[in-house]
Interface confidence: low
């Protein structure tokens, strides 16, 4: 397993609709044709997998099983969007990139993007 540098923004604020987007960029040492991207969430020293996608270079990412993530790729950049976030989902979201094919296998893990989610204030009931 060879190491690879992965860059991602330090902080992102989710929208009022609970959507957060950020770019995950990796320094590809070779000509990878198959890439796997995994988003991990670290909170309270616990790491959980949020979503994962495998894609062919130049093609779109396919997230599986009702994923809360969507994404597009462009060269060595992956544009990730995480939906349905609530205040309790605030945490450090780490981008992990694996160059699956062809060999050799490379692995890169970013420093993480701190995503802040603020639940919108509920609208007061209207009297008609």
């Amino acid at each position: 397993c060879k190491a690879m540098h992965v860059a991602q923004p330090a902080v992102v604020l989710a929208s009022s609709r609970g959507i957060a987007s950020f770019v995950c960029e990796y320094a590809s040492p070779g000509k990878a044709t198959e890439v796997r991207v995994t988003v991990l969430r670290q909170a309270d020293s616990q790491v959980t997998e949020v979503c994962a996608a495998t894609y062919m270079m130049g093609n779109e990412l396919t997230f599986l099983d009702d994923s809360i993530c969507t994404g597009t790729s462009s060269g060595n950049q992956v544009n990730l969007t995480i939906q349905g976030l609530r205040a309790m989902d605030t945490g450090l979201y780490i981008c992990k990139v694996e160059l699956m094919y062809p060999p050799p296998y490379y692995l890169g893990i970013g420093n993480g993007t701190q995503i802040y989610v603020i639940d919108p204030e509920p609208c007061p009931d209207s009297d008609f």
Epitope: R36, A52, T54, Y55, N59, E60, T62, L64, D65
Partner: antibody, heavy 120, light 106 residues
Framework: EVQLQQFGAELVKPGASVKMSCKAS????????MDWVRQSHGKSLEWIGN????????SYNQKFKGKATLTVDKSSSTAYMELRSLTSDDTAVYYC?????????????WGQGTLVTVSS | QIVLTQSPAIMSASPGEKVTMTCSAS?????MHWFQQKPGTSPKLWIY???ILASGVPARFSGSGSGTSYSLTISRMEAEDAATYYC?????????FGTGTKLELK
Amino acid sequence: EVQLQQFGAELVKPGASVKMSCKASGYTFTDYNMDWVRQSHGKSLEWIGNINPNSESTSYNQKFKGKATLTVDKSSSTAYMELRSLTSDDTAVYYCTRDGNRYDAWFAYWGQGTLVTVSS
Amino acid sequence: QIVLTQSPAIMSASPGEKVTMTCSASSSVTYMHWFQQKPGTSPKLWIYSTSILASGVPARFSGSGSGTSYSLTISRMEAEDAATYYCQQRTSYPLTFGTGTKLELK
């Protein structure tokens, strides 16, 4: 009504290639990926790969890279799979099946399968 | 790749009997999905996202589980339930199917 139409059977010689089709109807062809699954006689199911008819991007099971090529013809709402360098191990029923999305279950629709027999 | 092992490989049950079959994954998966297949026919989606019954599936079927251990249960076996059942994961590529459990009528 969603339908995936596959055609019967193919008898091919070892080393040859075969191209099978899967004609979709009853939905917008470009809205859903199409997957292909293999089932050897009396065995389990193996996922070969899938294709996005809109972008024509593909994902393959590593096992079938170099063996299978997935393509589509959007004008006729038809997905194709070509298998090359066939051996007796490739004798199987090949199914096309439709992906889902957040609202529709995956693999809810299947073709009736194409039986490929590799024999000299 | 994630390997799915189903047990038992073959089982038989009498009408009215409760049936449980299991699917064990080599690593954790988000959901498990189940397909029913009868000889000479295409597989049918039977249970998806672990516990949701596909359209037309009788309520005597149920699915449960999490992580690496999942199961399909029939509360009361009926003759039409005799078939082979396959589990499937879509958590990571390549998508994989289980080895299958053949359910026979006793």
